[in-house]
């Protein structure tokens, strides 16, 4: 029969023959030959391979370095890498989450549109008319101005995006 030029899934071509790839979680220790099968062995502790492969070395699990603000979100297995995330109050600087930075705070005049997560920073928005924020915060949204009318008061000082309105008693005109 003609030697193959392509192999089935989970196989690879070597010296005109199809050989089995190693399954995820295992590395190649000996190639198949004309007379022998592929030999694979499990990855060691703290190692992984996540695909059908012919790798001679397993990959090291990612280390979630606490000095960089990282912690383990999901422990790695022989078939998966460790997933890191950031400590409370911090978020990843990249998709790979190799280090963390402190969540940004929204300055006065801005409120939190979206609270930060382990992988995304705080999203701030300017307080629209009728709303204010007088603090720098990673959690506070823009607050609505106080409604003086509902308290039977009148606006003595207009609000801004950084300050609330100041209410005062109504001037009662005597008859």
């Amino acid at each position: 029969p003609e030697p193959p030029t392509a192999c089935r899934e989970k196989q690879y071509l070597i010296n005109s023959q199809c050989c089995s790839l190693c399954q995820p979680g295992q590395k190649l220790v000996s190639d198949c030959t004309e007379f022998t099968e592929t030999e694979c062995l499990p990855c060691g502790e703290s190692e992984f391979l996540d695909t059908w492969n012919r790798e001679t070395h397993c990959h090291q699990h990612k280390y979630c370095d606490p000095n960089l603000g990282l912690r383990v979100q999901q422990k790695g297995t022989s078939e998966t890498d460790t997933i890191c995330t950031c400590e409370e109050g911090w978020h990843c600087t990249s998709e790979a989450c190799e280090s963390c930075v402190l969540h940004r705070s929204c300055s006065p005049g801005f409120g939190v549109k979206q609270i930060a997560t382990g992988v995304s920073d705080t999203i701030c928005e300017p307080c629209p008319v009728g709303f204010f924020s007088n603090v720098s915060s990673a959690f506070e949204k823009c607050h609505p101005w106080t409604s003086c009318e509902t308290k039977d008061l009148v606006v003595q000082q207009a609000g801004t995006n950084k300050t609330d309105v100041v209410c005062g008693p109504q001037d009662r005109l005597r008859a």
Partner: antibody, heavy 116, light 107 residues
Amino acid sequence: EVQLVQSGAEVKKPGSSVKVSCKASGYTFTDYYINWVRQAPGQGLEWIGWIFPGSGSVYCNEQFKGRVTITVDKSTSTAYMELSSLRSEDTAVYYCASSLGKFAYWGQGTLVTVSS
Amino acid sequence: DIQMTQSPSSLSASVGDRVTITCKASQSVVTAVAWYQQKPGKSPKLLIYSASNRYTGVPSRFSGSGSGTDFTLTISSLQPEDFATYFCQQYSSYPYTFGGGTKVEIK
């Protein structure tokens, strides 16, 4: 039929280098790892390292790091092992052997003598 | 590095004898062990791979067994052409390492 044919015996001075060749035939050269193994007179076998001709990847025994260079010439299906800073303890028969892990095919060996 | 301790280092036997050579690994190598035969002035020849699989063309009197750290090569009935030196090798992890060898001599 798979064949690995090595270069001839060498006599070298301490501190010099030696380059041993291994010409492969009878199979697709780029498909199989080529290993280098040595055997001092009357002694056991010691693995030096491998090269995968398909990619040029090399993996060496730490004991030889910095002193050994393993290369291939795909156009002639030949692998080379160069050992530098030779000392008398490097006197040995140097073998090339193909396949990863287990060594199914061996060259005939090259005797390297290091002597002043 | 994984040490492969082979014993005995030499033995004397007669044609027809059953011969057993052992190899002990300093840590588990699972079944990634090969056995080679070497005659004076010649290159080693692969006999057994993956601890117990006989390589093509190797006579059935040669057999291998073991896993983890303890491995055995057995020659069931020694023949005149079997007088040689035998080596075990682990290929579970780098660097690959060999046993010191067992010389089988004629009694």
